[in-house]
């Protein structure tokens, strides 16, 4: 969490941002909140990006003002106009690109004063893994697949029964470049699995960590998966 304050002759207002990560090809949110004002026409929101000449987005006098918008953001940004009055200056970003990563500044002016806060935005690709029993294999084998990751993640297998065991000798992981030539499909195979055990396939890069679990018993197979973004710090 980053909390910024204004420093000019006018009073300063508190502006709060949260570091976040964007999944390339999908939409992202750059979070920013501020002390609200009672009059929408008195609020100015400016989003800037370090190293970028033009503005990322500007909202003032109750409407978007994009004449100074930088080329790389054209047609890709929007504020939640109906929420500005309650202090929400968050920015929606369409079709996140790798090059959108960087330091952003959320700069606010209201009748109460000015304030700003920086936000670190990481970009990459992350997706939920799915673990299945590979019935085509000669021995009991598990196959963990996740369709989109970038940068290249690490894959680690674990099991409930053999806690702390190193499965690197009995697993094989491959990375296959997807058609857009950036993200990769992750496939990891675990051999010699035993029945009545829960196995976890953990995929992690510097942006996200995802786990796919599979519980294999004689009578049923249960699956569960979850994904967690790393380094979501408020500012």
């Amino acid at each position: 969490l980053i909390i910024g304050f204004g420093i000019s002759g006018r009073h300063s207002i508190t502006v709060t941002t949260v570091a976040s990560a964007g999944n390339i090809g999908e939409d992202g949110i750059l979070s920013c909140t501020f002390e609200p004002d009672i009059k929408l026409s008195d609020i100015v929101i400016q989003w800037l990006k370090e190293g970028v000449l033009g503005l990322v987005h500007e909202f003032k006098e109750g409407k978007d003002e994009l004449s100074e918008q930088d080329e790389m953001f054209r047609g890709r940004t929007a504020v939640f106009a109906d929420q500005v009055i309650v202090g929400n200056a968050s920015l929606r970003l369409k079709n996140v690109q790798l090059t959108d990563a960087g330091t952003y500044k959320c700069y606010i002016i209201t009748s109460k004063g000015k304030g700003n806060a920086n936000l670190e935005y990481k970009t990459g690709a992350f997706s939920m893994p799915e673990v299945n029993v590979d019935y085509n294999a000669s021995s009991e084998t598990l196959r963990c697949e996740a369709p989109r990751w970038f940068p290249q993640p690490t894959v680690v297998w674990a099991s409930q029964v053999d806690q702390g065991a190193n499965f690197s000798e009995v697993s094989n992981t491959s990375f296959e470049l997807n058609s857009e030539n950036v993200t990769m499909k992750v496939v990891s195979v675990l051999y010699n699995v035993t029945i009545n055990n829960t196995y976890s396939c953990m995929i992690e890069n510097d942006i996200a960590k995802a786990t796919g679990d599979i519980k294999v018993t004689e009578s049923e197979i249960k699956r569960r998966s979850h994904l967690q973004l790393l380094n979501s710090k408020a500012s």
Partner: antibody, heavy 119, light 107 residues
């Protein structure tokens, strides 16, 4: 309320240039992009180009060499020019405005102007 | 270019019927799909944007769903004024593209 009104010559000779205007009201050209879409008689919709609030443009690659879009913010008017017209360019040409600043759909359309390419 | 394939290309239905039109994108377009209604000699009218958001003033019998590559426009109970041509379009990547249209006729 938001309005877009196209105007143009109606008939253009093959090989000549077409210049259309789109006069807008009810919103500012510094807030929204303006799209150009055409529809040949009895056919579907075809996206041609967009001019953004900043003045930068994006074109359908199939028309890149023949198309130029510009605007005058003070006159609230967008200009569309297509060169080297041929018979297959006969269509109704529309200008349209997006529903949001992130292009999620074309909410406001002009009435359209029919351009016939004929000698 | 992303192809938007609409089906069916024409459809006969009666007043009160529930009608579904589908649109398939040749690659993922997130939720950047919009639906339009067009009547002869008129400009298209936006019905649905962002795959599922009903545009201002559009009757609640129109609904949209889908994400990724598969999208649907549903008219829950056809009214006489709904007989028209419907188009889907994607605004995810350039060039923006439209489906070939579905002509909805009275049975």
């Amino acid at each position: 309320q938001v309005q877009l009104v196209e105007s143009g010559p109606g008939v253009v000779q093959p090989g000549r240039s077409l210049r259309l205007s789109c006069a807008v009201s009810g919103f500012s050209l510094t807030s929204y992009g303006v799209q150009w879409v055409r529809q040949a008689p009895g056919k579907g919709l075809e996206w041609l180009a967009v001019i953004w609030s900043s003045g930068s443009t994006d074109y359908n690659a199939a028309f890149l060499s023949r198309l130029t879009i510009s605007k005058d913010n003070s006159k609230s008017t967008v200009y569309f020019q297509m060169n080297s017209l041929r018979a297959e360019d006969t269509a109704v040409y529309y200008c349209a405005r997006d529903v949001t600043t992130i292009v999620e759909g074309f909410a406001h359309w002009g009435q359209g102007t029919l351009v016939t390419v004929s000698s | 270019d992303i192809q938007m394939t609409q089906s069916p290309s024409s459809l006969s239905a009666s007043v009160g019927d529930r009608v579904t039109i589908t649109c398939k994108a040749s690659e993922k377009v997130g939720t950047y799909v919009s639906w339009y209604q067009q009547k002869p000699g008129k400009a298209p009218k936006l019905l649905i944007y962002g795959a599922s958001n009903r545009y201002t003033g559009v009757p609640s019998r129109f609904s949209g769903s889908g994400s990724g590559t598969d999208f649907t426009l549903t008219i829950s109970s056809l009214q006489p004024e709904d007989f028209a041509t419907y188009y889907c379009g994607q605004t995810y990547s350039y060039p923006f593209t439209f489906g070939q249209g579905t002509k909805l006729e009275i049975k």
